[in-house]
């Protein structure tokens, strides 16, 4: 094939090599950019900055090499449009630093930075950590800081992410109240801070106030939906990012719902209870306290992480006629109590038979599957015992 005279020439089916001395000062308008998976750049002394707009449209890029060039600055968001980037070689450039934000969100298998005049500071604490943890092939590079010695020896005692303290009200919060949260941010080189309120939706009216180092947040006219929702304060400095999440407990009275008993492998009287604080529960059977045993007990379903309502069953393992009756669920918390009742009829008396009647005990030879923690059983083809009305 004839030599390629352009600044950048195709390499393989989805690669591009740009090696002609001084031909590039930016990466705008590279040919076939949207399909590129590999980009190799060398000897580009005028290529000094790498910014967000430079890599727009390179969504398929996996490998990026910029070596022996004049790169001095890589923007923190430079690789926002290249989420699939896995190998990044920026060796032998003029980089003094590289922000932790630059590689955040990427799954880099390889990061090469050797041959750069790195300046040891807290801004490179993340890179030192990569070296300590053996990430991205960094340890093998034995990175040096210009005139300061090995990166591994950089003192880091003062290199911490911001420290956050979120103050929440001590007192009970009721529906309709206004709640003031304050986030105190401490640390060196604070850059940005804010609140993440994505979970709140219609739980309150939100008003932000203040700025670093003390951020305020007013949640006005709160609803019970605010319970279990995260309110997150975040802050960043040159070392990294810190987040602290809190939840505001909004008190509201107990409520309860009962549903008709359903037969599964066992019987279940389904219920839902709500309230903050979580209500205590008590079952009554025909008006008397029901003692829970391995045959009759409360079983909760896995709770949803972001809501207070709990669903469950009063589980009955093979109940008989003595379990027929009125079931009441009482729920109570300091703000109120509630109850619901339901009649359940599981079976007529299976133990009384006409002496002349045969007792049907035929068994199927086929195993039935068990998913419930009950024994895998071989079960009757016909119901066990025909109920007979006794005069």
């Amino acid at each position: 094939a004839a030599p390629c005279p352009d600044a950048c020439c195709p390499h393989g089916s989805s690669g591009l090599r740009c090696t002609r001395d001084g031909a590039l000062d930016s990466l705008h308008h590279l040919p076939g950019a949207e399909n590129l998976t590999e980009l190799y750049i060398e000897n580009q002394q005028h290529l000094q900055h790498l910014e967000l707009r430079d890599l727009r449209g390179l969504g398929e890029l996996r490998n990026l090499t910029i070596v022996k060039s004049g790169l001095r600055f890589v923007a923190p968001d430079a690789f926002h449009f290249t989420p699939r980037l896995s190998r990044l070689n920026l060796s032998f450039n003029a980089l003094e630093s590289l922000s932790w934000k630059t590689v955040q969100g990427l799954s880099l298998q390889e990061l090469v930075l050797s041959g750069n005049p790195l300046h040891c500071s807290c801004a490179l604490r993340w890179l030192q950590r990569w070296e300590e943890e053996g990430l991205g092939g960094v340890p093998e590079q034995k990175l040096q800081c210009h005139g300061q010695g090995p990166l591994a020896h950089m003192p880091n005692a003062s290199c911490g992410v911001p420290t956050l303290k979120v103050q929440v009200p001590n007192a009970s919060v009721d529906v309709g109240d206004d709640v003031l949260l304050r986030c105190q941010v401490e640390g060196r080189g604070l850059e940005q801070a804010g609140w993440i309120l994505t979970e709140l939706e219609q739980s309150a009216t939100v008003m932000k106030s203040g700025g670093l180092p003390s951020l305020g947040l007013t949640l006005a006219n709160v609803t019970s939906d605010l319970n279990r929702k995260n309110v997150t304060c975040w802050a960043e400095n040159d070392v990294g990012r810190a987040e602290v999440s809190v939840q505001v407990n909004v008190s509201f009275p107990a409520s309860v719902q009962l549903h008709t008993a359903v037969e599964m492998h066992h019987w279940c009287i389904p219920f839902s209870v709500d309230g903050q604080p979580a209500p205590s529960l008590r079952w009554l059977f025909n008006g008397s306290v029901l003692n829970e045993t391995s045959f009759i007990f409360t079983e909760f379903l896995e709770p949803a992480a972001n809501e207070t309502v709990r669903h469950g069953c009063l589980r009955l393992n093979q109940p008989t006629h003595v379990n027929n009756g009125n079931y009441t669920l009482l729920a109570a918390n300091p703000f109120g109590q509630a109850s619901a009742s339901i009649m359940a009829a599981f079976m007529d008396n299976p133990f009384e038979f006409n002496p002349e009647d045969p007792i049907p005990v035929s068994f199927s030879p086929v195993d039935t599957n068990s998913t419930s923690g009950d024994p895998v059983e071989k079960k009757d083809e016909t119901p066990f015992g025909v109920s007979v009305a006794v005069g």
Partner: antibody, heavy 115, light 108 residues
């Protein structure tokens, strides 16, 4: 397949406390099952001691209630039996099992009460 | 009273049918379960609840109940069925479990 394994001292002094642990493997102690202890004196029948649910509910044999404590350790996936003020009459093979049907049992451990 | 009564011993000729019974007031209210125990071994569940048989238990074992009596029937007894058999159930209050005294089955 759920498996249960009892462990604890094989010899306890009279008036002392018998302590046994049952390790559950092949399933979670926090499942929808209760866990129980049963004992069998040499040459005699089975006696139910008590049962526990992972949420803390317990029921004990009325004849032993004043001396028995059953507890559960969810983090270790095990449950335990303590029987205080033991006498020679408490010498038995002690079994743990899954309630309510006792469909899985440990192999049993003989505890002798003797000075 | 909160107790279950079993015959101490029962025998059966090889291949014949045998019925082991368990009596108690609570059996008018609750199902019985049955356990087989061979010397030096832990008991094994053979019938539970409403006449259910766990996986792996031969279909010659069956359960029935009438009035205050629960029965375990072995249809065509085998030599390996020689063992102690225990019934259990809830007591009359429903709050505790009780065992019968056991029946020693001999297969002749």
């Amino acid at each position: 397949e759920v498996q249960l394994q009892e462990s604890g001292p094989g010899l306890v002094k009279p008036s002392g406390t018998l302590s046994l642990t049952c390790a559950v493997s092949g399933g979670s102690i926090s499942s929808s099952n209760w866990w129980t202890w049963v004992r069998q004196p040499p040459g005699k029948g089975l006696e139910w001691i008590g049962e526990i649910y992972h949420r803390g509910n317990r029921n004990y044999n009325p004849s032993l209630k004043s001396r028995v404590t059953i507890s559960v350790d969810k983090s270790k996936n095990q449950f335990s039996l303590k029987l205080s003020s033991v006498t020679a009459a408490d010498t038995a093979v002690y079994y743990c099992a899954r309630a309510p049907w006792f469909d899985y049992w440990g192999q049993g451990t003989l505890v002798t009460v003797s000075s | 009273s909160s107790e279950l009564t079993q015959d101490p011993a029962v025998s059966v000729a090889l291949g014949q049918t045998v019925r082991i019974t368990c009596q108690g007031a609570s059996l008018r209210s609750y199902y019985a379960s049955w356990y087989q125990q061979k010397p030096g071994q832990a008991p094994v569940l053979v019938i539970y609840g409403k006449g259910n048989r766990p996986s792996g238990i031969p279909d010659r074992f069956s359960g029935s109940s009438s009035g205050n009596t629960a029965s375990l029937t072995i249809t065509g007894a085998q030599a390996e069925d020689e063992a102690d058999y225990y019934c259990n159930s809830q007591d009359s209050s429903g709050n505790h479990l009780i065992f019968g005294g056991g029946t020693k089955l001999t297969v002749l």
